[in-house]
């Protein structure tokens, strides 16, 4: 699996999740999070070959495309697959208020 | 949405459905299906730009990230949202199968 | 590499006030919080505040309200913490501490603060 | 305010043997929890972040577990340079108050 467990232990050129730490205040200028002051978000980047975690027959087809076709401007590209969410801490007033955000953080990548 | 209806009528240079068609047997080597003898698989390219067509939070997070650190190499990727399946033809033997291949046809596209 | 190097040891009368500095190098200042730590001798660790240098936005603990003041200078890369009407109570080693991804990663060698008469 | 209560305040215990040190929060603090290791005399060093990751250059023998409100952190096989004090603190909304301390002695 092209997860945080592979990927960040591994040189890995292809597709795989990649830490990015997003600071929110300074990276989105989200003030309004008081907690935590910013999280590793991750994401996804490298090239997806012929096979590579492909995630339905179109991604297998275009990737076989893309092989055969080198020149083509059309293949897979590597996106989130597992993303898990996050907890935060802002505040209405002088109301503190817990939110859990979904979807937040990439786990896992697939090529799509 | 970023489906066929929309791209293919509009000169549209951000995140979009693309038309592609692919011959079995001269793009991908495929001689053993029979009929059709190739299809419209499309694909989806083009820019993510903040807020178009985010599949989840982390897209979003990841398109203002973008917006705010353009020379970030993180930014969200143009990928398929709906597929369609594609009835297929070929012979096991002498006797004809039909079968229905699923996630074929890219319909719209999202960034994720 | 990052370093925060402080201020050198302070000794001041009760009633007095004083300004103890860190100087930052090896990151981004303006976009980190910066915190502030007191420790009495033998005893443990307690948070006073933080500031954001880039717009000097800071957030105390409400027992050092009145008593701290934070301050950041973006031009020399140099976080302050102003401490007034001093007590003996006040004496201790005063750190400053970069807040990075929930945690206080890297720490200053501490300022020594003595109050006496 | 969230109260942080660190147990046991003192340890004596020898090389070689492992040793757990806890941390309880007053409330949910959702693991954004940090350790560290003061030596006599010098400032506090990162050990763990985020409750359970570990920071750069700090031995694979420490390892910091839990969530919620109940966590620790586990020292194995101890070493002469991991005697020392021992805090956690927690970042889930300031102030961010500091466990009193772990004093862990050699017998």
């Known amino acids: 699996a092209l997860d945080t467990n592979y990927c960040f232990r591994n040189l890995e050129e292809n597709c795989c999740v990649r830490p990015l730490y997003i600071d929110f205040r300074q990276d989105l200028g989200w003030k309004w999070v008081h907690e935590p002051k910013g999280y590793y978000a991750n994401f996804c980047s490298g090239p997806c070959p012929y096979l590579r975690s492909a995630d339905t027959t179109h991604s297998t087809v275009l990737g076989l495309y893309n092989t055969l076709n080198p020149e083509a401007s059309a293949s897979p590209c590597c996106v989130p697959q597992d993303l898990e969410p996050l907890t935060i801490l802002y505040y209405v007033g002088r109301t503190p208020k817990v939110e859990q955000l979904s979807n937040m953080v990439v786990k896992s990548c697939k090529c799509s | 949405a970023l489906d066929t209806n929309y791209c293919f009528r509009n000169l549209e240079e951000n995140c979009c459905v693309r038309p592609l068609y692919i011959d079995f047997r001269q793009d991908l080597g495929w001689k053993w299906v029979h009929e059709p003898k190739g299809y419209y698989a499309n694909f989806c390219s083009g820019p993510c730009p903040y807020l178009r067509s985010a599949d989840t939070t982390h897209s979003t997070v990841l398109g203002l990230y973008n917006t705010l650190n353009p020379e970030a190499s993180a930014s969200p990727c143009c990928v398929p949202q709906d597929l369609e399946p594609l009835t297929i033809l070929y012979y096991v033997g002498r006797t004809p199968k039909v079968e229905q291949l699923s996630n074929m046809v890219v319909k719209s596209c999202k960034c994720s | 590499q990052v370093q925060l190097q402080q201020s050198g040891a302070e000794l001041v009368k009760p009633g007095a006030s004083v300004k103890i500095s860190c100087k930052a190098s090896g990151y981004a200042f303006s976009s980190s919080w910066m915190n502030w730590v007191k420790q009495r001798p033998g005893k443990g660790l307690e948070w006073i505040g933080q500031?954001?240098?880039?717009?000097?936005?800071?957030n105390y603990n409400g027992k050092f309200k009145g008593k701290a003041t934070l301050t950041a200078d973006k031009s020399s890369s140099t976080a302050y913490m102003q401490l007034s009407s001093l007590t003996s109570e006040d004496s201790a080693v005063y750190f400053c501490?970069?807040?990075?991804?929930?945690?206080?990663?890297?720490w200053g060698q501490g300022t020594t603060l003595t109050v006496s008469s | 305010d969230i109260q942080m209560t660190q147990s046991p305040a003192s340890l004596s215990v020898s090389v070689g043997e492992t040793v757990t040190i806890t941390c309880r929060a007053s409330e949910n603090i959702y693991s954004n929890l940090a350790w560290y290791q003061q030596k006599q005399g010098k400032s506090p060093q990162l050990l763990v972040y985020?409750?359970?990751n570990l920071a750069d250059g700090v031995p694979s023998r420490f390892s910091g577990s839990g969530s919620g409100t109940q966590y620790s952190l586990k020292i194995n096989s101890l070493q002469s340079e991991d005697f020392g004090s021992y805090y956690c603190?927690?970042?889930?909304?300031?102030?961010?108050?500091f466990g009193g301390g772990t004093k862990l002695e050699i017998k």
């Open positions: 500031i954001y240098p880039g717009d000097g936005d800071t």
């Open positions: 501490a970069r807040h990075y991804d929930g945690s206080t990663d890297y």
């Open positions: 603190q927690h970042f889930w909304g300031t102030p961010y108050t």
């Open positions: 985020a409750a359970t």
